[in-house]
Interface confidence: low
């Protein structure tokens, strides 16, 4: 999906008002220095590409993020403020249904959400400082 046509300011507002708080809730009890940020992005469309990938694509050791509150709100924000985004997500929805039903917070998931927090922060302060 090409995120260049999204309404970035509206997505930023959704992040600041709710998504950021849900990410903090998910990470509660984890030291902010526990994980190093290894994923970055160079501008807002690129950040959204990385955010979508980390939030909705199951990874080894963390298959359940798509059911979390921050993920559902992220999906809603992208669906509302990115033209045509919903149509591209039919396959992703099928993958979500196949994800395990119980919410299991593994260390790998915590690390992934820590990366997401960094990506969202970068989304709000775009421009990668080095490529």
């Amino acid at each position: 999906y090409d995120f260049t046509n999204c309404d970035f300011e509206k997505i930023k507002a959704a992040y600041l008002s709710t998504i950021s708080k849900d990410l903090i809730t998910y990470m509660s009890g984890t030291k902010s220095t526990e994980f190093n940020n290894t994923v970055s992005c160079s501008n807002r469309p690129h950040c959204l590409t990385e955010i979508q990938s980390l939030t909705f694509n199951p990874t080894a050791g963390c298959a359940s993020l798509a059911k979390e509150m921050f993920a559902m709100k992220t999906k809603a924000a992208l669906a509302i403020w990115c033209p045509g985004y919903s149509e591209t997500q039919i396959n992703a929805t099928q993958a979500m249904k196949k994800a395990r039903k119980s919410k299991v917070t593994t260390n790998k998931c915590l690390e992934q959400v820590s990366q997401l927090q960094g990506l969202w922060r970068r989304f709000n302060r775009p421009l990668l400082k080095q490529q």
């Epitope: 260049t4 160079s42 501008n43 807002r44 469309p45 775009p126 421009l127 990668l128 400082k129 080095q130």
Partner: antibody
Framework: QVQLQQSGPQLVRPGASVKISCKAS????????MHWVKQRPGQGLEWIGM????????TLIQKFKDKATLTVDKSSSTAYMQLSSPTSEDSAVYYC??????????WGQGTTLTVSS | DIQMTQSPASLSASVGETVTITCRAS??????LAWYQQKQGKSPQLLVY???TLAEGVPSRFSGSVSGTQFSLKINSLQPEDFGSYYC?????????FGGGTKLEIK
């Protein structure tokens, strides 16, 4: 309305340090990055570097690392570029330009620097 | 660093004609490319960003497109005010680089 007002033309002797200013108005200074671009007479555009006014973090391309120093004064919403030990190669028009996503929606009017003995 | 190769370096055309300027990136920069117009003695002005999004106030005769690593700026029905220099610039990540420029002159 958004404006980037640069300092006037400067004539400097080789080796004498020079400082160019870029005063921003009409928007939140710390929200946007400030970039600097060089254009030699009759030539194309060359990216020098950028500064984040919110925390003064700077990035300069290798060839300008020992030449340019970027600073900001948040209280006056002004960005500065200082060029050390200028030579004739530094004679050019220097532009400041603001950006969020890497493209420049507003530019300063340019500052002409002439290095001559 | 990403290199931007712009062509042609110069171009002569008449008012009313359609012209296309191209820019090729040395690697994949997705849609992260901007186009600027610069008149003699003036600052560059943003025309297009994200390869195909028209900047505010830019006439609809300007359009941007992308195919892989090749980007194009098309100007339909040239107007007298369209003559000047045009530059592409990638905005994918540091260091930002510009194409060498295209000088568009009146035939």
């Amino acid at each position: 309305q958004v404006q980037l007002q640069q300092s006037g033309p400067q004539l400097v002797r080789p080796g004498a340090s020079v400082k160019i200013s870029c005063k921003a108005s009409g928007y939140s200074f710390t929200t946007y990055w400030m970039h600097w671009v060089k254009q030699r007479p009759g030539q194309g555009l060359e990216w020098i570097g950028m500064i984040d006014p919110s925390d003064s973090e700077t990035t300069l391309i290798q060839k300008f690392k020992d030449k340019a120093t970027l600073t900001v004064d948040k209280s006056s919403s002004t960005a500065y570029m200082q060029l050390s030990s200028p030579t004739s190669e530094d004679s050019a028009v220097y532009y400041c330009a603001r950006t969020l996503d890497g493209y420049y929606d507003y530019w300063g009017q340019g500052t002409t620097l002439t290095v001559s003995s | 660093d990403i290199q931007m190769t712009q062509s042609p370096a110069s171009l002569s055309a008449s008012v009313g004609e359609t012209v296309t300027i191209t820019c090729r990136a040395s690697e994949n920069i997705y849609s992260y490319l901007a186009w600027y117009q610069q008149k003699q003695g003036k600052s560059p002005q943003l025309l297009v960003y994200f390869a195909k999004t028209l900047a505010e106030g830019v006439p609809s005769r300007f359009s941007g497109s992308v195919s892989g690593t090749q980007f194009s700026l098309k100007i339909n029905s040239l107007q007298p005010e369209d003559f000047g220099s045009y530059y592409c610039q990638h905005h994918y990540g540091t260091p930002w680089t510009f194409g060498g420029g295209t000088k568009l002159e009146i035939k």
